[in-house]
């Protein structure tokens, strides 16, 4: 199992800081964090050492290490808290896309452990969230929307408590996906039309579900026929 | 609000074992890192042993001074970390203190006192 | 293993006074210092950590300062509350090790 440096769990910084982070393995060793400027890599053998001398609010994120030649698959991981008094948030991505019924994980993470307290969920213009929003918060993570509906596709934004007032992240789009329970039902009418060449005719393709997001298309044995 | 508290501390012989507890609150233990730090006015503070979290395999560490001696472990159920002392020496004797790692020793409980002495 | 030498390890001083506490590290630790304070029958407590940041509820009197091998705690306006024992304490890797400590004691 790799072991990174320093040996702490959360680290807090200031930003401009110099930061290091070193991984050692038994073997090679990889990084993984969120995408952010600045970090330059140096690899050597079995250790690996991630460096930058102008920490931002963007590096704000987990780092984790992993041995890709351990069969056990261990890692290790170290949070890092860039600490911004103008940028309490850093957005990881500006777009969710999760099917119904799945947790949605809005990526915006807290640049300062000591914010937390005061951190709350809205959606944009800050109108409140839906009736019935089941949500949780992480500092390492983001806020988490349990078990989300078709109805909660909205823009949200994440919002935190920095002297007495509130300090709003960029957006975050959130779309959830209805489940298909099954093949739609397809009707074709009528069954049987009979017309003389040159004739109008009146072919009805219908589908149920049509809030799901599904192609309807004739087909006449293998040619797509424009409607 | 975090509370950390140790027990089991004791006089014990040369070469006889204890086991101290911590009862950890107020905190996700199962998230937590834990460590025993202990002091002598010899010594001064010193590091003993760590068990990180879960998601960090349950991995442990030892001070020089203590490898194959003790055992630190933990049960996330309980939120309750354990160190198993065996082949007691004096120079073991000190207050143990159990801590809580985040940024740095975040946490530390009030300390159990043990004298090794014959 | 990284050693830790703290200096002075004691120091008389009146209320009021500024005072500043350091600490070596044998080789590089990259700002990964912790600072604690020790009252007198207490347990430690957490001042700085990361070299430069305040623990949560330390007055601002407090500072850290210091990169590579060389650390420093600094308390302006000393206050009655700040006597007792400092320590420093580095993060990188394990064994952790602390430094001697700093007793400070009122003149």
């Known amino acids: 199992i790799p072991v990174i440096e320093p040996s702490v769990p959360e680290l807090v910084v200031k930003p401009g800081a110099t930061v290091t982070l070193r991984c050692v393995g038994n073997g090679s060793v990889e990084w993984d964090g969120p995408p952010s400027p600045h970090w330059t890599l140096y690899s050597d053998g079995s250790s690996s050492i991630l460096s930058t001398n102008n920490a931002t609010f963007q590096n704000t994120g987990t780092y984790r290490c992993t041995e890709p030649g351990d069969p056990l698959g261990g890692s290790a991981a170290i949070h890092l808290y860039v600490k911004d008094p103008a940028r309490p948030w850093n957005v990881l991505a500006q777009e969710v896309v999760v099917f119904e019924d799945q947790d949605a994980l809005l990526p915006c993470l807290l640049t300062d452990p000591v914010l937390e307290a005061g951190v709350s969920l809205v959606r944009v213009r800050g109108r409140p969230l839906m009736r019935h929003t089941n949500y949780s918060f992480s500092p390492w993570h983001g806020f988490t929307i349990h078990r989300a509906k078709f109805i909660q596709s909205q823009d949200y934004q994440c919002s935190a408590l920095m002297g007495g007032r509130k300090v709003m992240s960029i957006s975050i789009r959130l779309k959830v996906q209805k489940v298909i329970p099954g093949p739609p039902a397809l009707t074709l009418v009528p069954a049987e039309l009979v017309r003389i060449r040159g004739e109008a005719a009146q072919i009805v393709c219908s589908a149920s579900s049509v809030d799901v997001n599904f192609d309807v298309f004739l087909q006449h044995n293998n040619t797509k026929l424009a409607i | 609000e975090v509370k950390l508290e140790e027990s089991g501390g004791g006089l014990v012989q040369p070469g006889g074992s204890m086991k101290l507890s911590c009862a950890a609150s107020?905190?996700?233990?199962?998230?937590?890192?834990m460590d025993w730090v202990r002091q002598s006015p010899e010594m001064g503070l010193e590091w003993v042993a760590e068990?990180?979290?879960?998601?960090?395999?349950?991995?442990?560490f030892y001070a020089e001074s203590v490898k194959g001696r003790f055992t630190i472990s933990r049960d996330d159920s309980k939120s309750s970390v354990y160190l198993q002392m065996n082949s007691l020496r004096p120079e073991d004797t000190g207050i143990y203190y159990c801590t809580r790692v985040k940024v740095g020793f975040d946490n530390w409980g009030q300390g159990t006192t043990l004298t090794v002495s014959s | 293993d990284i050693q830790m030498t703290q200096s002075p390890a004691s120091l008389s001083v009146s209320v009021g006074e500024t005072v500043t506490i350091t600490c070596r590290a044998s080789?590089?630790?990259?700002?990964?210092l912790a600072w604690y304070q020790q009252k007198q029958g207490k347990s430690p407590q957490l001042l700085v950590h990361a070299a430069t940041n305040l623990a949560d509820g330390v007055p601002s009197r407090f500072s850290g300062s210091g990169s590579g091998t060389q650390y420093s705690l600094k308390i302006n306006s000393l206050q009655s509350e700040d006597f007792g024992s400092y320590y420093c304490?580095?993060?990188?890797?394990?064994?952790?090790?602390f430094g001697g400590g700093t007793k400070l004691e009122i003149k």
């Open positions: 107020g905190f996700t233990f199962s998230d937590a890192w």
């Open positions: 304490q580095h993060f990188w890797g394990t064994p952790r090790t």
């Open positions: 080789e590089n630790i990259y700002s990964n």
């Open positions: 068990i990180r979290s879960k998601a960090n395999n349950h991995a442990t």
